[in-house]
C-alpha cells in the first residue's frame, strides 16, 4: 500500500535485522516525469539493490557486526540518466540479533589489593568484549564471581561490578583481609551477555588471582605537643605514608584556623612550624590527603591530632583592680564577708591553675592586725576577731597575694563597714489593686509602679531593696526593675502575657534587703504587697511548635512518600488548616488536618537542597488569622546522573598522515555528590567495531586518555563512543562521542580550503 | 535492427519554417529518448535537445530555446523538429539519435537531413 | 555550461602506429556512483556520428578492441593502438553529465 511500502522519493530510515534472509521488499520509490529510473549508491556492500522502477531490496543476510548502519542516497534519473531528483538519504539500520558470544580479554587477571581498602573501590577491572549490540541486551554484560578461594566461613571477601567487571572488596573484606593470615586469593568470574537475564545468554569466564598486600595508609597515634617550645622550628611532630612512592601529600584544615601552625613534606612528614599557645588553642585536628599525579585522592583521608600540653606560663589575675566587700558593724565571727576569685588562664585543674590566696597587709590595722583571715584555696574572706565599729574605723583596706606554683599577685580589697541592717523595708501600699491589660501588650512594657522605704544606713546593703515576685507568676511573665538611688520598683513585662493559660494572676511582691537582717528582726507583713493582673483575650495566630522545620529523605524516595510534618496549635484552640507556600518546583503536598508533607514528584538534589518551602497555618473559623514557619527538605544524594563529557570535545584533530600513534585527554563529570574522594569512574569503548582503530586507557577516577592504535586513517571525521561508568550505587554508564577529525595540516592546524571554513578543529593533536 | 531514419534535405527561404521527421524501427519507441544535434558544412556537433516520447517531456539548449521545437508521434515511432523563423546562419545538417534508456549510451544516430535555408 | 576542448585540431599518424587524443572538461564528468559520464564519437567523412566509447572507458557495442578510453574526472584519452585506414575521420568528446550535453570541437586524425 501507498506509505508504508511504497511513495515518493524522500530521506528515510529503514531497521532490518541481522542474520535474516531477504523476505520482503524495503521500499517501492515511485518516479515523477520526467524521472524515469532509479539509480543507488552508497554503502550498498553488493547488498542492496534498487531496481529500475524503484524497488528497493536486499539480496543477502545483513551483518550489524560488519557494518551497523549503510548510508544509501537514491537519486531519479530522466531517460538520459541525468539526475532530476535527489539523491535523497536512505539509512538502513541493521538490528542486532545475538550471534555473538562474550569473550575476555584475557583468560588470566592478577591484580593487588591493599587491606582495609575502602569497600566498593576498584582495584582491578576484568573486560570482557561482545561484538553485539551494547545498546541492546544482546551486548550487555553481566559479570559474576562464580567461586572465591579460599573462602573463610562462607563470607565473600571480594565483590564484583556486574555492569562494569570492577572487582572491590566487600565490607567484609575490607576488614578481614590480612595478608599475614592468606596472602593469596583466586576468584572464578563469568560474564554473560543478555544482562545475565536470560538462559539463552552466552558466557565466558577467567580466572583472577589476587595478592593482598599490607596497608600503611593509617592515621598515626595522637600527637602532644607542649607550648611556647623554644626548639627551633619546624619540629618533626609525627607522619603518614602512603602504600606507594610518588603521592601528593597535603594537609586540610577543616577548621580554617586564621593561622595554621602544620606542614607536610613530600614523605610525609609532619611539622609543627611555629610555637604553640595552649591558651589561644588548646587542640588541632586536621587532615592528611594523599593524592596522585592528577591532584586526584588516593585514599580517604587520615585525621591527625595534636593536643597541645600546658606549661605554666600566665600568673594568676585578679577580678578588678579593687573588690569592695561590705560588713555590718555586729558581724559575727566566722561570718563571710564575700569571696575573691581570682583567675588564672593556664590549664584548668592542674597545678599550673591551682591558686593560693594570703593576706599580707591590713591598713589600718585598728583596733589591731588580723582582723581577717582568708581561705587559702577557696578566697573566702571571713571576721576573724571581733566586731568592727563604724565610728572608729569605717574601711578596711586587704592586699592579698594570690599565688599558682611559679606566679604571685597581689590583688587589693575594700571593706567597708556599714550600720547593722535592723530595720526592714515596709511598702508604701499593701495592695495596688487591679491592672486590666491585653495579652498582646509587648514585652519590655512597664505596667506598674511599686515603692517600699528602709531607714538603715543609705546606700549601703542594709538599705538597698530588691523586690521578687513570690507568688502568683510561676511562668516568670513578670520582672521588676529597681532604682538604686530610689529604691522605686518598676514591674515590666518579660514574656508574653497569656489569657489562655493565665486570664487572672493574683501577684505577691517581696522586699527584701542584700544584707542580712540583724539576729531578732524578721521580714513581716509590711515587707509584701499585692496586686491583681486581669489579662484580657485577643485572637492570636497559630503557633509553630518550631521556628524551622527540617526533615532529611534520599532524593529517590517513590512519590507519595512522606517526607516530614509540621505541627502548629492556636492559643484559642481554633482547629488549624496547613498549607505550603513557595514549593516553586510542585514537589510537595501539605495534609491540611495533619500537617504531615509527602512528596507529590520525583526529587532531585542536583536541583538543589535543602529544598526550602514555607508552611502555613491558618485558623479554621474565626479570623482565619496565620501563622509562617520554614519546612528544609534536605536531600541526600543517590546515584541518578549518568557521567558525561566535563566540557565540549569539538575540534579534536590529528595530521594526517599520522606519522605514530597519537593520544589526546579527555576529562568526564557528572552531578553526583562526591564528597571527598571524588568521582572514580571507568571508560571503555563504546562498541566492540572501535576496538581495531583505537584503545580508552583510565588516568585517574576523572581523566582518560583515547590513543590510536595504529596510523592508517583515512582525512576524515570519526566519531568516537566511549562509554564511562561512574561505579555508583546502581552504576550509571553514560555513552558519549568524541568527534576525532584527521585533515591535512598547515603549521599544525587543520587546513581548510577557502568556503570550507565551517567547523574547522582547533585542537591539535 | 534498430534505424533511425530521417527525412531528406529541405531547401526553405530566410524567414520560413520546417520540419524534419525521424521514424524509428527495431525497437519500442516511447522507451527510449530521442536527441537533435545540428552540424554546420565544416563545424563541430552542437547538442539542441531531446524528447522522451512516453511522457512527451523535452530539454532544450537555452541556445536553440524559440528556434527548435521537439515533438513525437507514438502511433506512427517518429519524433519531430521543427525549425522557426530559419536564416542562413541555420543552415545545417541535423541528427537524430537514440539514447538507450538504463544504460545511457547514444548507440544508434540517423543519417541526417540538410537544410539550407537561401533566398 | 560545462565546456569540452579538444587543443588539438588534428593528428598525423602513420598507419600501424599508436596514437592519442585527448579532451578536458570545466568541470568533474564524475558521479557520485563512480561513473564517468563522457562519451567518445568517430565521424567518418559524409557520415553520421558513430559511438566508440561510453561513460569514459567503455567500449561500444562491434567497436574493435583497438580503441580505449581513459582519464581522470576533467582530463580524459582516447588511445587508438594499430591505426588503420579506416579509422580516419573526426573524433569528438562529449559530456553527458548535466544539460546541455556540449561536444569538443573535434580533433581530426589524418594518415600520413
Known amino acids: 500500500q501507498e506509505g508504508k511500502f511504497s511513495g515518493p522519493l524522500k530521506p528515510m530510515t529503514f531497521s532490518i535485522y541481522e542474520g535474516q534472509e531477504p523476505s520482503q521488499i524495503i521500499f517501492q520509490f515511485k518516479a515523477n516525469p520526467p524521472a524515469v529510473t532509479f539509480e543507488l549508491t552508497g554503502e550498498t556492500d553488493n547488498i542492496f539493490v534498487i531496481e529500475r522502477e524503484g524497488l528497493l531490496y536486499y539480496n543477502r543476510a545483513l551483518d550489524r557486526e560488519t557494518r551497523s548502519t549503510h548510508n544509501l542516497q537514491v537519486a531519479a534519473l530522466d531517460a538520459n540518466g541525468i539526475i532530476v531528483e535527489g539523491p535523497v538519504p536512505i539509512t538502513i539500520k541493521v538490528k542486532d540479533i545475538n550471534d555473538n558470544r562474550p569473550t575476555f580479554l584475557q583468560s588470566k587477571y592478577e591484580g593487588s589489593v591493599r587491606q582495609n581498602s575502602r569497600p566498593g573501590k576498584p582495584f582491578l577491572y576484568v573486560n570482557a568484549t561482545d561484538l553485539d549490540d551494547p545498546a541492546t541486551p544482546n551486548g550487555q554484560l553481566y559479570y559474576q564471581i562464580v567461586i572465591q578461594l579460599p573462602m573463610i566461613n562462607n563470607v565473600m571477601y571480594f565483590q564484583i561490578n556486574n555492569k562494569t567487571g570492577a572487582i572491590s572488596l566487600t565490607r567484609e573484606g575490607s576488614q578481614e583481609l590480612n595478608p599475614a593470615k592468606n596472602p593469596s586469593y583466586n576468584l572464578v568470574i563469568s560474564v554473560k551477555d543478555m544482562g545475565g537475564q536470560s538462559e539463552n545468554s552466552f558466557s565466558d569466564t577467567t580466572s583472577v588471582d589476587i595478592i593482598v598486600t599490607e596497608n600503611i595508609w593509617k592515621a598515626p597515634k595522637p600527637v602532644e605537643m607542649v607550648e611556647n617550645s623554644t626548639d627551633p622550628h619546624p619540629i618533626k611532630i609525627t607522619q603518614v605514608r602512603w602504600n606507594d612512592p610518588g603521592a601528593q601529600y597535603s594537609l586540610v584544615d577543616k577548621e580554617k584556623l586564621p593561622r595554621f601552625p602544620f606542614s607536610i613534606d613530600q614523605e610525609g612528614d609532619i611539622y609543627v612550624t611555629q610555637p604553640l599557645d595552649r591558651e589561644e588553642k588548646d587542640a588541632y585536628v586536621f587532615y592528611a590527603v594523599a593524592k596522585d599525579e592528577y591532584g586526584k585522592p588516593l585514599s580517604y583521608p587520615l585525621e591527625i591530632h595534636v593536643k597541645v600540653k600546658d606549661i605554666n606560663d600566665n600568673p594568676p589575675t585578679c577580678p578588678s583592680p579593687v573588690t569592695v566587700f561590705e560588713v555590718q558593724e555586729n558581724e559575727r565571727l566566722g561570718n563571710s564577708i564575700g569571696t575573691l576569685t581570682a583567675h588564672d588562664r593556664d590549664e584548668e585543674n592542674t597545678a599550673n591553675s591551682f591558686l593560693n590566696y594570703r593576706i599580707v597587709e591590713q591598713t589600718p590595722k585598728l583596733p589591731m592586725d588580723g582582723l581577717f583571715l582568708i581561705q587559702t584555696y577557696a578566697g573566702m574572706l571571713q571576721l576573724a576577731k571581733q566586731s568592727l565599729k563604724k565610728q572608729d574605723t569605717p574601711q578596711y583596706n586587704l592586699t592579698i597575694e594570690v599565688s599558682d606554683k611559679d606566679f604571685k599577685t597581689l590583688c587589693f580589697v575594700q571593706i567597708n563597714v556599714i550600720d547593722i541592717n535592723d530595720q526592714i523595708p515596709i511598702f508604701e501600699k499593701s495592695d495596688y489593686g487591679n491592672l486590666t491589660l491585653a495579652e498582646d501588650t509587648n514585652i519590655g512594657s512597664t505596667i506598674l509602679t511599686i515603692q517600699a522605704t528602709d531607714a538603715d544606713e543609705p546606700f549601703t546593703g542594709s538599705s538597698k531593696i530588691l523586690y521578687h515576685i513570690i507568688k502568683g507568676d510561676s511562668e516568670g511573665r513578670l520582672g521588676v526593675d529597681t532604682d538604686p538611688h530610689t529604691n522605686t520598683g518598676y514591674v515590666i513585662i518579660k514574656k508574653p502575657l497569656d489569657f489562655e493559660t493565665a486570664a487572672v494572676s493574683n501577684i505577691v511582691f517581696k522586699a527584701e534587703n542584700p544584707e542580712p537582717l540583724v539576729f531578732g528582726v524578721k521580714y513581716n507583713a509590711s515587707s509584701f504587697a499585692k496586686f491583681t493582673l486581669i489579662v484580657t483575650d485577643v485572637n492570636e495566630a497559630p503557633q509553630f511548635s518550631q521556628h524551622v522545620f527540617q526533615a532529611k529523605v534520599s532524593e529517590d524516595v517513590a512519590i507519595g512518600t512522606k517526607v516530614g510534618n509540621v505541627t502548629a496549635k492556636d492559643p484559642e484552640g481554633l482547629d488549624i488548616s496547613y498549607s505550603l507556600r513557595g514549593d516553586t518546583r510542585g514537589w510537595l503536598k501539605i495534609d491540611h488536618v495533619t500537617g504531615e508533607i509527602f512528596s507529590v514528584a520525583p526529587l532531585d538534589r542536583e536541583a538543589g537542597s535543602p529544598y526550602r518551602v514555607q508552611v502555613v497555618a491558618t485558623e479554621v473559623g474565626g479570623s482565619s488569622l496565620s501563622s509562617v514557619s520554614e519546612f528544609h527538605l534536605i536531600l541526600m544524594d543517590v546515584n541518578d546522573n549518568p557521567p558525561r563529557l566535563a566540557k565540549d570535545y569539538t575540534g579534536l584533530f590529528f595530521c594526517h598522515p599520522l606519522s605514530a600513534p597519537g593520544s589526546l585527554i579527555f576529562e568526564a563529570t557528572d552531578d553526583d555528590q562526591h564528597l571527598f574522594r571524588g568521582p572514580h569512574f571507568t571508560f571503555s569503548l563504546g562498541s566492540g567495531s572501535l576496538q581495531n582503530d583505537w584503545e580508552v586507557s583510565k588516568i585517574n577516577g576523572t581523566h582518560a586518555r583515547l590513543s590510536t592504535r595504529h596510523t592508517e586513517f583515512e582525512e576524515r571525521e570519526y566519531v568516537v563512543l566511549i562509554r564511562i561508568n561512574d561505579g555508583g550505587r546502581p552504576p550509571l554508564e553514560g555513552i558519549v562521542s568524541l568527534p576525532v577529525t584527521f585533515c591535512s595540516c598547515v603549521e599544525g592546524s587543520c587546513f581548510r580550503p577557502a568556503g570550507h571554513q565551517t567547523g574547522i578543529p582547533t585542537v591539535g593533536m | 535492427q534498430v534505424q533511425l531514419q530521417q527525412s531528406d534535405a529541405e531547401l526553405v527561404k530566410p524567414g520560413a519554417s520546417v520540419k524534419i521527421s525521424c521514424k524509428v524501427s527495431g525497437y519500442t519507441f516511447s522507451d527510449h529518448a530521442i536527441h537533435w544535434m545540428s552540424q554546420r558544412p565544416g563545424q563541430g556537433l552542437k547538442w539542441i535537445g531531446y524528447i522522451y516520447p512516453r511522457h512527451g517531456t523535452t530539454n532544450y539548449n537555452e541556445n536553440f530555446k524559440g528556434k527548435a521545437t521537439l515533438t513525437a508521434d507514438t502511433s506512427s515511432s517518429t519524433a519531430y523538429m521543427q525549425l522557426n523563423s530559419l536564416t542562413s546562419e541555420d543552415s545545417a545538417v541535423y541528427f537524430c539519435a537514440r539514447m538507450r534508456n538504463y544504460f545511457y549510451v547514444m548507440d544508434y544516430w540517423g543519417q541526417g537531413t540538410s537544410v539550407t535555408v537561401s533566398s | 555550461d560545462i565546456v569540452m576542448t579538444q587543443a588539438a585540431p588534428s593528428v598525423p599518424v602513420t598507419p600501424g602506429e599508436s596514437v592519442s587524443i585527448s579532451c578536458t572538461s570545466s568541470k568533474s564528468l564524475l558521479r557520485s556512483n563512480g561513473n564517468t559520464y563522457l562519451y567518445w564519437f568517430l565521424q567518418r567523412p559524409g557520415q553520421s556520428p558513430q559511438l566508440l566509447i561510453y561513460?569514459?572507458?567503455n567500449l561500444a557495442s562491434g567497436v574493435p578492441d583497438r580503441f580505449s578510453g581513459s582519464g581522470s574526472g576533467t582530463a580524459f584519452t582516447l588511445r587508438i593502438s594499430r591505426v588503420e585506414a579506416e579509422d580516419v575521420g573526426v573524433y569528438y568528446c562529449m559530456q553527458h553529465l548535466e544539460y546541455p550535453f556540449t561536444f569538443g570541437s573535434g580533433t581530426k586524425l589524418e594518415i600520413k
Open positions: 561513460r569514459m572507458s
